[in-house]
């Protein structure tokens, strides 16, 4: 009876999300394997988040709006492990917008989700950021490693969206 009611709840939750995400990929987790964590298909998952790589070339503001429509934000990178996971799926000759900007050009970098910007957990390429006119951040492959660079916000780039996993 308990299992039945849990299944019914799960199905109704799935139906609720179906209007936003036509398809979800779920895995069982938790100590009793009773919880399901889901990401929209074909997003990838890492820890408690889902990631989507957009190959559409758009300005930073448009890229953020595009993520927002999907219930996400441009990616906020919190750890080296998270960055290493993300970069596995990136093309080395491309650049991708991050959810990091400095709209006033005062070198006050801010994450789109208001996560505090911690200088100790940043992965700027050597010599970056280097221009107060370049107010948006990308991740790209340079000098044999992935790192961040400041670029003009209006110049179209690919982008990475991130959202919290859906738990059902």
């Amino acid at each position: 009876n308990f299992m039945y009611s849990k299944t019914v709840k799960r199905l109704s939750k799935l139906q609720e999300y179906q209007q936003y995400y036509p398809s979800l990929t779920c895995v069982m987790e938790g100590k009793d394997m009773e919880d399901w964590s889901c990401c929209p298909t074909p997003w990838t998952s890492f820890q408690s988040s889902c990631y989507f790589i957009s190959t559409v070339m758009q300005s930073w503001t448009k890229s953020q709006n595009n993520c927002s429509v999907m219930g996400a934000d441009l990616v906020v990178i919190n750890t080296k492990e998270e960055q290493d996971f993300i970069t596995q799926n990136l093309k080395i000759n491309s650049a991708y917008f991050l959810g990091l900007s400095d709209p006033k050009g005062w070198r006050h970098w801010q994450w789109v989700d208001q996560t505090p910007y911690n200088k100790n957990v940043t992965f700027w390429h050597s010599g970056e950021p280097n221009s107060p006119d370049e107010r948006c951040a990308i991740i790209n492959f340079r000098s044999e490693e992935w790192g961040w660079n400041d670029v003009h916000c209006h110049v179209p780039q690919k982008s990475i969206c991130k959202m919290k996993k859906i738990y059902i």
Epitope: Q58, S59, S101, K104, C136, H152, C153, H154, V155, P156
Partner: antibody, heavy 121, light 111 residues
Amino acid sequence: EVQMVESGGDLVKPGDSLKLSCAASGFTFRSYGMSWVRQTPDKRLEWVATISSGDSYTYYPDSVKGRFTISRDNAKNTLYLQMSSLKSEDTALYYCARQIYYDYAYYFDFWGQGTTLTVSS
Amino acid sequence: DIVLTQSPASLAVSLGQRATISCRASESVSFRTSHLMHWYQQKPGQPPKLLIYGASNLESGVPARFSGSGSETDFTLNIHPVEEEDAAAYFCQQSIEDPPTFGGGTKLEIK
């Protein structure tokens, strides 16, 4: 006083090449992104090319991509526009303009007086 | 590309009255509190001159009778009271994404 003086405009034939120059003074030229903007005979303003302050980025609309090249010489405080395979629709008054970044975008705070290009057979 | 449509194409306003020029963008040129529309004035035989940046910020040296407002896709330039020297063409411009684009212009005549 900020000044920008364009030169090099001429009457040319379709298919010809031409180089425009813009001599800047009264500001630290190397610190600013610069653009060329043209005004067509019907008075419409049309962006033609942009170059970033550090010379690292250049951008063009599809209408001139592959035919026009923007460049700068920071030592000479001069902006250039090399134009080739010119068409009659390139006929316009060409302005150089200084860019000021504002939040996620930019505007043009100073414009030169312009130089006229006429493409006609 | 973002298309900017200005209206009216021309208008005649009596001295001391209000002139209102509209600029509509084909998609939003705002992001959160940033409204990325700019306005220029062009007198015959002269280059465009910046009046307003960021929808409502008056450029240094521009008289306070000029004001701008708007967000997302709809922006307005107001001139009040209109003076003789305001006879000119007015253009809106966006650069939230490449390519930067301009409106078709509005010609203001003083009656």
